[in-house]
């Protein structure tokens, strides 16, 4: 059997760090057997069998010129094996962030915080966090850990399905390369990372006979499974063409009548969604839809209470009528109140999405 431990990575390749001493191991001999070392294609002896280093070649302070293929020979001139040296760096803690577009699934993405230059893989798992009271020690419910299944197409993403909205989870993303492993832990709760997809199917139509009105309607994003306790609320913005500022209203339901449109001008309209109890954040804006108020015969405009803030159709209220939410109000986040780095010696930048 070979005296050389096989690091994770392609066979026949051994690894080291630039600027560090590197040991290469002759794979086809017995441990301790004296061998001669050559660079592939070069006749010059690098290290002879009398070096006292047995089956190993030592390169002091390796640099990029040392990368390449090496050949080791036994005392009788037989080939002991060929070894390719690749230099790079041990893993650093990856940068990890998690997102949720609905209330029962979330995904986490990662990227290296430093480029190692070596073959790299990521191990992803998660666990439900539980703080046990002394009297509940006898029965610890199943909290994992479980694997976080990675996207099959090699994207740096894994998805947790069937998460509990009120639970907190710990994600473990470990970067592994032939020189070691480094782990990033991240605690996530659906209620804090929830960001719905934008509403879909936005339509803007004129209201015949009302030159200052536009009727906008939209649907829930397809990714959001509607349930009485997990509804969305919406925010609608509109502006006339060439007008820089948006007007904002919060409609009730899935449609809104704008009552202060500028007659004769096309208007851009967009909508955003958020959990109706303010978990997480607002979605991105939907693609803009355009509409121009009617120029038909004028109806008497009835002054409405909203004073240009948009008027909801009665049908919407009926349509959205549902039982009172059986969901507790959101807990304040118990997180640090400042930005000092505590239990880690390594500092990493986090990209906010």
């Amino acid at each position: 059997s070979s005296p050389c431990p096989q690091a994770w990575g392609p066979p026949g390749v051994q690894y080291g760090q630039p600027g560090r001493s590197v040991k290469l191991c002759c794979p086809g001999v017995t441990a301790g057997d004296p061998v001669s070392w050559f660079r592939d294609g070069e006749p010059k002896l690098l290290q002879g069998p009398d070096s006292g280093l047995g089956h190993e070649l030592v390169l002091a302070q390796a640099d990029s010129t040392d990368e390449g293929t090496y050949i080791c020979q036994t005392l009788d001139g037989a080939l002991g094996g060929t070894v390719t040296l690749q230099l790079g760096y041990p893993p650093a803690r990856p940068v990890v962030s998690c997102q949720a577009a609905d209330y029962e699934n979330f995904s986490c993405t990662w990227s290296p915080s430093q480029i190692s230059g070596l073959p790299t893989r990521y191990l992803t798992s998660y666990r439900k966090k539980t703080v046990l009271g002394a009297d509940s020690q006898r029965r610890s419910p199943s909290t994992g850990p479980w694997p976080c299944p990675q996207d099959p197409l090699g994207a740096a993403r894994c998805v947790v399905h069937g998460a509990e909205f009120w639970s907190q989870y710990r994600i473990n993303v470990t970067e592994v390369n032939p020189l070691g492993a480094s782990t990033r832990l991240l605690d996530v709760s659906l209620q804090s990372i929830l960001r719905p997809d934008p509403p879909q199917g936005l339509r803007v139509e004129s209201v015949p006979g009302y030159p200052r009105r536009l009727h906008a309607s939209w649907t829930y994003p397809a990714s959001w499974r509607r349930q009485p306790h997990f509804l969305l609320k919406f925010r609608l913005q509109y502006r006339p063409a060439q007008h820089p500022a948006w007007s904002t209203v919060e409609p009730i339901g899935l449609e809104e009548v704008i009552t202060d449109a500028v007659a004769g001008l096309p208007h851009a309209v967009r909508v955003s969604a958020r959990d109706f109890l303010d978990a997480g954040t607002w979605s991105a804006w939907s693609p803009e839809a355009w509409g121009t108020p009617s120029t038909g015969p004028l109806q008497d405009e009835i002054p409405d209470w909203s004073q240009g803030h948009g008027q909801q159709l009665e049908a919407v209220v009926a349509q959205e009528d549902s039982p009172a939410p059986a969901r507790p109000s959101l807990q304040p986040d118990p997180r640090p109140l400042d930005h000092r780095d505590p239990l880690e010696q390594h500092h990493h930048h986090h990209h906010h999405h």
Epitope: V95, S140, G144, R170, L185, P336, D341, P342, L343
Partner: antibody, heavy 126, light 112 residues
Framework: EVQLLESGGGLVQPGGSLRLSCAAS????????MGWVRQAPGKGLEWVSY????????GYADSVKGRFTISRDNSKNTLYLQMHSLRAEDTAVYYC???????????????????WGQGTMVTVSS | QSALTQPPSASGSPGQSVAISCTGT?????????VSWYQQHPGKAPKLLIY???KRPSGVPDRFSGSKAGNTASLTVSGLQAEDEADYYC???????????FGTGTKVTVLG
């Protein structure tokens, strides 16, 4: 059953060394932050040391820094406290404890010890 | 790493409420929402009562509640019972040396 069991305590002379062990069972040890807390006879609790799930980061109280080393072997589900240059004031019951911790995108924080061992007595005396 | 300051003792009759304060600095109690409270009976290991200022672990009665204002955290035990007679300690993330810090401890006596 979720359990922590300390061992290794005993009588040692000033300047001597001792190694405490804490065997964990009933939970996935490698995912948890762990710590040591001590209590001198008739006194209050004193936070001693703390270690990351992977063992990569540690923390110590000023009173033991440079003399005590915390470590863990996740393959054996065991936490250790190596104590050197022991003093009379190190005499105490030493508890091993588990912490969920809290990990943000950049940092992890000590949170609360939810599971405790029964303690092991260390006596430093000549 | 100075210990957090607690009153040495507190007392109340059965059914009454007792509040224990825990004063630190902006580097510990005031700077982080990682304040926890423990109960310890003589000769026993401590038991977690409250974590992250206000949260109760499973199995801890709702007679125990926590709060915080500025650099001072508080534990309130309402509806005192005989078995609540014990030592109580607060703890906080310490903000330095990857460290935590405990309070000086409060002995609660249930009168009568």
């Amino acid at each position: 059953e979720v359990q922590l069991l300390e061992s290794g305590g005993g009588l040692v002379q000033p300047g001597g060394s001792l190694r405490l062990s804490c065997a964990a069972s009933g939970f996935t040890f490698s995912w948890y932050f762990m710590g040591w807390v001590r209590q001198a006879p008739g006194k209050g609790l004193e936070w001693v040391s703390y270690i990351y799930p992977s063992g990569g980061s540690t923390g110590y109280a000023d009173s033991v820094k440079g003399r005590f080393t915390i470590s863990r072997d996740n393959s054996k589900n065991t936490l250790y406290l190596q104590m050197h240059s022991l003093r009379a004031e190190d005499t105490a019951v030493y508890y091993c404890a588990r912490d969920e911790g809290y990990c943000s995108s950049t940092s992890c924080y000590f949170d609360a010890f939810d599971i405790w061992g029964q303690g092991t007595m260390v006596t430093v005396s000549s | 790493q100075s210990a957090l300051t607690q009153p040495p003792s507190a007392s109340g009759s059965p059914g009454q409420s007792v509040a224990i304060s825990c004063t630190g600095t902006s580097s510990d109690v005031g700077g982080y929402n990682f304040v926890s409270w423990y109960q310890q009976h003589p000769g026993k290991a401590p038991k977690l009562l409250i974590y992250e200022v206000t949260k109760r672990p499973s199995g801890v009665p709702d007679r125990f509640s926590g709060s915080k204002a500025g650099n001072t955290a508080s534990l309130t035990v309402s509806g005192l019972q005989a078995e609540d007679e014990a030592d109580y300690y607060c703890s906080s993330y310490g903000g330095s040396n990857n460290a935590g810090v405990f309070g000086t401890g409060t002995k609660v006596t249930v009168l009568g």
